[in-house]
Interface confidence: low
């Protein structure tokens, strides 16, 4: 342990204010009381300290709270949060959504850092589930947050939280994640009428099973091609030409542009060419007349 230098006469800090930006590092160390700093943390953020000075202030807090900072200090860390390591954050017990918001605000505009990821992890684990308010907050700061969770983690999202999800929050989700989220969305929006329901459920349809797509085809929903292209291939394959036509409505013409891409390509291969011809789009690759079409599950059983 390095011997501590005494604070020069008249320099003892009575409060955390702008005069401290003119202190050298050793003067901050010697003249700022850690307990005073802890009680006036809210002032630190308004003062343009250098990063070296912030290191000194962090060191003082670390000495005062070796087991981890209390939430009253954490909430007012401001830019000092950027100095924290994931190891520091693992010692914290953050329970207030206001604290979480305050720290996310500091990191706003930056990519999600390891510190932020650790903070969110601590917060969510402390709450036991991703409730609506938390999800609302996290997706507001990080639209891709939901899709960064594993299917196992997503299983702890209650259906009520789904109301906080915006379409852009699901942009980077893969089919496994949508498989978990779709049933929750279906439950969350079950009491809405047809057209409103479709607007809400549309972003989640990448996790929808065949029977739900068949049901939607009966409701004049006019699904756009972008949504159709994100559907599970195994859910699309059993749909008939008539069902796809009803599902897409006026957008059915877009199938021609997508005929070489999944799931359209695979779906075409499963349809009778005669049925495809009824669409008048020039789709090719269907099953010629006179050929026997085996059910997909039978094909798998036979192979």
């Amino acid at each position: 342990e390095v011997e501590k230098t005494a604070c020069p006469s008249g320099k003892k800090a009575r409060e955390i204010d702008e005069s401290l930006i003119f202190y050298k590092k050793w003067e901050l160390e010697a003249c700022v009381d850690a307990a005073l700093l802890a009680t006036q943390m809210d002032r630190v953020n308004a003062i343009p300290f250098t990063y070296e000075q912030l290191d000194v202030l962090k060191h003082k807090l670390d000495e005062l709270y070796p087991q981890g900072y209390p939430e009253s200090v954490i909430q007012h860390l401001g830019y000092l949060f950027l100095k924290m390591s994931p190891e520091d954050i693992r010692k914290w017990n953050v329970t207030s959504l206001e604290t979480l918001k305050a720290l996310l605000e500091v990191n706003k505009g930056h990519e999600m850092s390891p510190q932020v990821a650790t903070l969110i992890d601590r917060f969510v684990k402390g709450r036991g589930q991703l409730d609506k308010d938390t999800l609302d907050t996290l997706t507001a700061f990080y639209p891709g947050y939901l899709c960064s969770l594993s299917p196992e983690e997503l299983s702890s999202v209650p259906p009520s939280s789904i109301w906080a999800v915006r379409p852009q929050d699901l942009d980077t989700c893969d089919p496994r994640q949508l498989d978990v989220l779709y049933p929750k969305a279906r439950l969350a929006f079950q009491n809405m009428n047809g057209s409103e329901y479709f607007v809400k459920i549309q972003s989640f349809l990448g996790g929808a099973p065949t029977e739900d797509l068949k049901a939607l085809s009966q409701q004049n929903v006019s699904m756009d091609l972008a949504t159709f292209m994100k559907l599970r291939t195994d859910a699309v394959l059993p749909l008939t030409v008539a069902e796809v036509q009803k599902l897409l409505g006026p957008h059915v013409e877009g199938l021609k542009a997508e005929e070489r891409h999944r799931p359209v390509r695979d779906w075409i291969l499963r349809q009778r060419q005669d049925d495809l011809d009824t669409l008048g789009l020039g789709l090719q690759g269907g099953i010629p007349n006179g050929y026997l079409v085996l059910d997909l599950s039978m094909q798998e059983a036979l192979s």
Partner: nanobody
């Protein structure tokens, strides 16, 4: 690292005015604090004025009431309006930017201010 370029230095009579400018290569939204430092002949570089990302401004006692720091995030520029200049304001003036997350301070090359009595 942020690149900083100062301009506006030069010679002035005591009681006169100068405006120093500092243009940053990065968006000022990503900079946590900006400051003007000065160094008269000798090794010591002192902080003259600083502005935090929240817009809070601070001044060294020697320049309070005479100098004004400001910035414009859109043009990535910071200024130091220097009024009622004194011979003791003669120094090389440096623009500095703090990035707390990266733990970096970036410096400009400096601009010379000379005040004659």
């Amino acid at each position: 690292q942020v690149q900083l370029v100062e301009s506006g230095g030069g010679s002035a009579q005591a009681g006169g005015s100068l405006i120093l400018s500092c243009v940053a290569s990065a968006n000022l939204f990503t900079i946590d604090a900006l400051g003007w430092y000065r160094q008269a002949p000798g090794p010591k570089r002192e902080l003259v004025a600083a502005i935090s990302s929240g817009g809070n401004k601070y001044y060294a006692d020697a320049v309070k009431g005479r100098f004004t720091i400001s910035r414009d995030t859109l043009t990535k520029t910071m200024w130091l309006q220097m009024n009622n200049l004194k011979p003791e304001d003669t120094a090389m003036y440096y623009c500095a930017a703090e990035d707390y997350g990266l733990g970096q301070r970036s410096w400009g090359m400096g601009t010379q201010v000379t005040v004659s009595s």
